[in-house]
């Protein structure tokens, strides 16, 4: 049965074997076309989602779909099923947390009072002041909460308790990339992980350990990619997969929290990058110990300059290393995460590309997550 | 199995527009990318632009922006290519080609090719 | 644009022979380099994609090596329906092809 399922596809009606390499190769070689059902799938960028979490202590904002123009959500009158029907609109299933904050002096959009109408947020029509003078603060899911704060050093030994949304991502039982735990459903990595492997069957993920072999597997339901542009073929490096049970939350296992849609990342912020990957450039072996490192925001412009990357960093991408070189990410850390750390930690960028490894003049090459929160949101509305 | 299947042949006169169809069966339609690639008489191939059936997003070459358009009808597998303002040098064999894959690919399954002559 | 050149332009061989064709990519294409064969009235067919891979069905003679950007296909024993033009396409950024290889009997 093991050799089988390793080497075989059972195809239905009627019952046949095919060969597991002709899965997801394009042609249908199972009469009723399932040995190309269960393949990695591409999912448009779709419409721009109506609500939006900023990061002023994550209040609630509205888009006006007739002006295009964005309100902050006043608190008068917001009740628990304007909360969940907010956070449904991005895609999320949990019961959501919020809290009244008081307008601050910077506010600078519109502040209105918010109903409902089929299943989504709009603005009341007859909406006259903020009379609480608060503004809606919500939380869609806990997330981004560690038991462990790392210290700041160099590169070091990492422990599942500060990073338990990391997870390993195998094929066939070897480590390809890492991941992050986004909610029980779903974890965030890189596209590029799936490009040698496109059926979704033999793809797994280990959860709440710092060791690579020694956590149990877990099965994957589907694999998402957003749609890949030849003529930009590093925009994009993003992809969601759908676990086929979902997670119990624990010490070990968590979410880390998705970034807000203007978080803007200074020159110089500090980062974290963790990782299995190789431990030198183009060198030995994936390093079975999690390894985390502290790094910062490389300057864009600095990132495109002629003895770098030469203008493919693109405004979906974001650079981070350490000026001197030394500390970067390397591969099979691809589809890990770039965090930054307010309150919670915050997935900010995901391990895509570089040359080479630690180079100090070509630093890593990031996915910008606030770049594809819509594809995110999108992608999780279909499939609630 | 995989097959591409394109419209007939067309005669044009410069100025003119033409559009040719390709018909995919035995697979995933909107699981794969289609390529545009076009050969003059005794030249080489020349790419020319390429359309995701998922999406309907398209991408073209730099010296075709503007005149070519491809377009998709999902409920028949069919992609379509229209050229524009037609002159005598797009007198050429027009093939519709598959993305192997939806990452970077090669082009593994082609059309049997469309002639298409521009001439007054 | 990334620009590809061939060399040679033309190529004659005995059958039985081995044939080495070249591409070489004017930036580094990765290993996203594919291969292509073309028979006078006929479409092209796929022999090597990610510059060593064979597509379904083609023969073991043809075998496809480097990266970056220098490439090259091997013909180890020609056949008699060898006798074709062969194109290189890279499809790192976008797609672009060579402008061919005429491989002719000797």
């Known amino acids: 049965k093991v050799i089988l399922d390793k080497y075989y596809f059972l195809c239905g009606q009627p019952l046949h074997f095919i060969p597991r390499k002709q899965l997801c190769d394009g042609e249908l070689d199972c009469p009723l076309g399932e040995d190309e059902e269960h393949c990695v799938k591409s999912f448009p960028e779709g419409p721009a989602v109506a609500v939006r979490l900023s990061k002023d202590r994550s209040t609630l904002q509205v888009l006006d779909s007739a002006t295009g123009n964005w309100f902050s959500a006043c608190f008068d009158n917001f009740t628990e099923a304007l909360a969940e029907t907010a956070c449904r609109q991005m895609g999320y299933s949990s019961k959501p947390t919020f809290r009244a904050v008081e307008i601050g002096p910077d506010q600078d959009l519109d502040v209105v009072e918010i109903t409902e109408n089929s299943q989504e947020l709009r603005m009341r029509n007859s909406s006259g002041p903020c009379l609480s003078g608060s503004l809606v603060s919500l939380h869609c899911l806990a997330c981004g909460k560690s038991l462990k704060t790392p210290r700041v050093v160099g590169v070091e030994e990492a422990s599942v308790d500060s990073w338990p949304w990391q997870v390993s991502i195998q094929y066939d039982k070897q480590h390809v990339c890492g991941g992050s735990i986004l909610d029980p459903h779903w974890v965030l990595t890189a596209a590029h992980c799936f490009r040698k492997h496109t059926d979704v069957f033999n793809w797994k993920v280990r959860a709440g350990s710092d060791k690579l072999g020694s956590f149990p597997s877990l099965a994957v339901a589907k694999i998402i990619i957003i749609e890949f542009n030849p003529m930009y073929p590093k925009d994009n490096d993003i992809a969601l997969m759908k676990l086929q049970f979902p997670l119990t939350f624990s010490g070990t296992v968590r979410p880390i929290c998705l970034p807000f849609f203007d978080e803007e990342l200074t020159p110089a912020t500090p980062l974290w990058i963790i990782g299995w990957g190789f431990t030198k450039q183009n060198g030995g072996k994936m390093s079975d110990i999690l390894l985390q490192a502290s790094v910062q925001v490389i300057d864009s412009t600095r990132c495109n300059a002629d003895d770098a990357y030469q203008g493919e960093v693109t405004e979906k991408m974001m650079c981070a290393g350490i000026p001197e070189g030394g500390v970067d990410t390397c591969q099979g850390d691809s589809g890990g995460p770039l965090m930054y750390q307010s309150d919670q930690w915050h997935v900010v960028g995901i391990v895509s590309w570089g040359y080479g490894c630690g180079g100090p003049s070509t630093p890593g090459v990031y996915t910008k997550v606030s770049a594809y929160l819509n594809w995110i949101y999108n992608v999780w509305k279909a499939e609630l | 199995q995989v097959q591409l299947v394109q419209s007939g042949a067309e005669v044009k006169k410069p100025g003119a527009s033409v559009k040719v169809s390709c018909k995919a069966s035995g697979y995933t339609f909107t699981n794969y990318y289609m390529h545009w690639v076009r050969q003059a008489p005794g030249q080489g191939l020349e790419w020319m632009g390429w359309m995701n059936p998922n999406s309907g997003n398209t991408g073209y070459a730099q010296n075709l922006q503007g005149r070519v358009t491809m377009t998709r009808d999902t409920s028949t597998s069919t992609v379509y290519m229209e050229l524009s303002s037609l002159r005598s040098e797009d007198t050429a064999v027009y093939y519709c080609?598959?993305?192997?894959?939806?990452?970077?690919?090669?082009?593994?399954?082609w059309g049997q090719g469309t002639t298409v002559t521009v001439s007054s | 644009e990334i620009v590809m050149t061939q060399s040679p332009a033309t190529l004659s061989v005995s059958p039985g022979e081995r044939a080495t064709l070249s591409c070489r990519a004017s930036q580094s294409v990765s290993s996203y380099l594919a291969w292509y064969q073309q028979k006078p009235g006929q479409a092209p067919r796929l022999l090597i994609y990610?510059?060593?891979t064979r597509a379904t069905g083609i023969p073991a003679r043809f075998s496809g090596s480097g990266s970056g950007t220098e490439f090259t296909l091997t013909i180890s024993s020609l056949q008699s329906e060898d006798f074709a033009v062969y194109y290189c396409q890279q499809y790192d950024i976008s797609v672009t092809f060579g402008p061919g290889t005429k491989v002719d009997i000797k």
């Open positions: 990610g510059a060593s």
């Open positions: 080609a598959r993305g192997r894959t939806w990452f970077r690919s090669g082009m593994d399954v």
